[in-house]
């Protein structure tokens, strides 16, 4: 069934914790992704930006998280209005934004 | 335009080892996936491993032992090479490129033949 | 590794009517709510082509007469109506696991 939405966002920070300690060399080779409005739709605005990394294992597992907890598809080169158009940030920062965002998220039990 | 085109040596000895190259054209290796996959003749597709923008490497668990893929991004190549070649490794073999996720092969090379002979 | 089992091997069917392709997964390719299965046309001399991806989603380009279903471990690749150009094999293709493996292929000809 699907993934109740406490155990999708754990999962999802769990991941990003994973990335952020394991990181070695730059993340994804340096790519640069779109900053993205930390509120409402944020899974798929996260989707939208990360969607345009390719060849990335380091967060093939986050877009299949995403993926899975947007309940739209999402292509690469699609944007909406949640992102922040002007300003681009390396994956690894977008990683770690993302990553404060959700904790805080959690902690206020702010789940959906 | 997106383009891959595979080079190899043809005919190989068994027991020798085999170095095929994939050079491509239309975008960078550094954020894109590239895999390997072979058909024998008359045969269908088999997946035999694949190097991902960021340098991981994944093989088939089958063929571990044989395969190093490796790539020189500043020159667009990816290569593939494979040790104690026997007379079913004989095949064509294709390079083919990730598209965006969810990782699709998207574009193919013609695919280079190669026959393992004696 | 996942093993696909495609069936049938080979199937002949009418100029206008409906062609299915069945995939079966040795276990689940689903992950976060998508199914990791793709879909490949080859025509003879040529390389494979993507048709369909996450099971479903019909790539840039490929006629809608092509469709794709199914999740976990039982997939269908339907065409419908068949047209002479779709004399080809098809493969189906999974990405669930970083061990990636094909189908065997199944041919269709077209009466």
């Known amino acids: 069934g699907p993934v109740p939405p406490s155990t999708a966002l754990r999962e999802l920070i769990e991941e990003l914790v994973n990335i952020t300690q394991n990181q070695k060399a730059p993340l994804c080779n340096g790519s640069m992704v779109w900053s993205i409005n930390l509120t409402a739709g944020m899974y798929c605005a996260a989707l939208e930006s990360l969607i345009n990394v390719s060849g990335c294992s380091a967060i093939e597992k986050t877009q299949r998280m995403l993926s899975g907890f947007c309940p739209h598809k999402v292509s690469a080169g699609q944007f909406s209005s949640l992102h922040v158009r002007d300003t681009k940030i390396e994956v690894a920062q977008f990683v770690k934004d993302l990553l404060l965002h959700l904790k805080k998220l959690f902690r206020e039990g702010q789940f959906n | 335009e997106v383009q891959l085109k595979e080079s190899g040596p043809g005919l190989v000895a068994p027991g020798g080892s085999l170095s095929i190259t994939c050079t491509v054209s239309?975008?960078?290796?550094?954020?894109?996936?590239i895999n390997w996959v072979r058909q024998p003749p008359g045969k269908g597709l088999e997946w035999l491993g694949m190097?991902?923008?960021?340098?991981?490497?994944d093989y088939a668990d089958a063929l571990k032992s044989r395969l190093s893929i490796s790539k020189d991004s500043s020159k667009s190549q990816v290569f593939l090479e494979m040790t104690s070649l026997r007379t079913d490794d004989t095949a064509t073999y294709y390079c083919?490129?990730?598209?965006?996720?969810?990782?699709?092969?998207?574009?193919w090379g013609q695919g280079t033949s190669v026959t393992v002979s004696s | 590794d996942i093993v696909l089992t495609q069936s049938p091997a080979s199937l002949a069917v009418s100029l206008g009517q409906r062609a299915t392709i069945s995939c079966r997964a040795s276990e689940s390719v689903d992950s976060y709510g998508n199914s990791y299965m793709h879909w490949y046309q080859q025509k003879a001399g040529q390389p494979p082509k993507l048709l369909i991806y996450?099971?479903?989603n019909l790539e840039s380009g490929v006629p809608a007469r092509f469709s794709g279903s199914g999740s976990r471990t039982d997939f269908t690749l339907t065409i419908d109506p068949v047209q002479a150009e779709d004399a080809a094999t098809y493969y189906c293709q999974q990405n669930n696991e970083d061990s990636r493996t094909f189908g065997g292929g199944t041919k269709l000809e077209i009466k």
């Open positions: 190097i991902w923008g960021d340098g991981r490497i």
């Open positions: 083919a490129r990730d598209g965006y996720f969810p990782y699709a092969m998207d574009f």
């Open positions: 239309g975008f960078s290796l550094t954020d894109s996936s």
């Open positions: 996450l099971a479903s």
